[in-house]
């Protein structure tokens, strides 16, 4: 799978973890830190 | 199915506001980028500007720093426009359109005229 | 804010013609654009985004390209239902479209 940093005006889009845009998927994605969750890393979970 | 739709069309004397909302079903703006461009007649395609609904930042075209307003409400997964002090060159179709995860998807468009 | 020079304005070619439109942008935009394609009356069509994707269901004649400040964007071989005019978009930093290209079939 080809990935590569997102777009400058996604930065902030993943509150808690980084942006990754997937080029075969067309699709930008969140990677969340430890702990948090949801499409944009937005849930903490214990 | 994801859906954008639009407020229908607006008729407005200059000087005046309008607001045009544009509802999302399908998903949930919160995930998303909401941004606004328009296209007056005959002319070419222009970026207004957009709202992050979740953290509720908003980030305009100087050209309409001042005029205009985008707001969104979540509880409703609704966003809204508001363009201020009218000019007949504010006559355009005005879409909204939903970026984030995916590329854009866009609203059907609404008509705004302004006419005295 | 990033400015997009979008070049011809309007171009007049035959069927069966190679159609070439640029996009130049005021810094580097990371591959970060996309083309759209517009009929009178329409909304807006997503032909390509990131550069060179195509979008399902685009045919394969529409292609595009490019990296850093210049892109290109290709038609190999027009047909008469191409005729619409063409917008390049930014969206690195926020977003800038280009001013357009009229394509007529001469």
């Known amino acids: 799978v080809s990935i590569t940093k997102c777009n400058s005006d996604m930065n902030g889009y993943c509150l808690h973890g980084q942006c990754i845009y997937l080029v075969d998927m067309s699709q930008n994605y969140c990677r969340c830190e430890v702990g948090y969750t949801g499409v944009r890393c937005e849930h903490f979970y214990l | 199915q994801d859906q954008l739709v639009q407020s229908g069309a607006e008729v407005k004397k200059p000087g005046a506001s309008v607001k045009v909302s544009c509802k999302a079903s399908g998903f949930n703006i919160k995930d998303t980028y909401i941004q606004w461009v328009r296209q007056a007649p005959g002319q070419g395609l222009e970026w207004m500007g957009r709202?992050?609904?979740?953290?509720?930042?908003?980030k305009y075209h100087e050209k309409f720093e001042g005029r205009v307003t985008i707001t969104a409400d979540t509880s409703t997964n609704t966003a809204y426009m508001e363009l201020s002090s009218l000019r007949s060159e504010d006559t355009a179709v005005y879409y909204c359109v939903r970026s984030g995860r995916e590329f854009d998807f866009w609203g059907q468009g609404t008509l705004v005229t302004v006419s005295s | 804010d990033i400015q997009m020079t979008q070049s011809p304005s309007s171009l007049s070619a035959s069927v069966g013609d190679r159609v070439t439109i640029t996009c130049k942008a005021s810094q580097d935009i990371h591959k970060y654009i996309a083309w759209y394609q517009q009929k009178p009356g329409q909304a807006p069509r997503l032909l390509i985004q990131y550069t060179s994707t195509l979008q399902p269901g685009v045919p394969s004649r529409f292609s595009g390209s490019g990296s850093g400040t210049d892109y290109t964007f290709t038609i190999s071989s027009l047909q008469p239902e191409d005729i619409a005019t063409y917008y390049c978009?930014?969206?690195?930093?926020?977003?800038?479209f280009g001013g357009g290209t009229k394509v007529e079939i001469k």
């Open positions: 978009l930014q969206y690195d930093n926020l977003r800038t």
């Open positions: 709202i992050d609904p979740l953290r509720r930042q908003t």
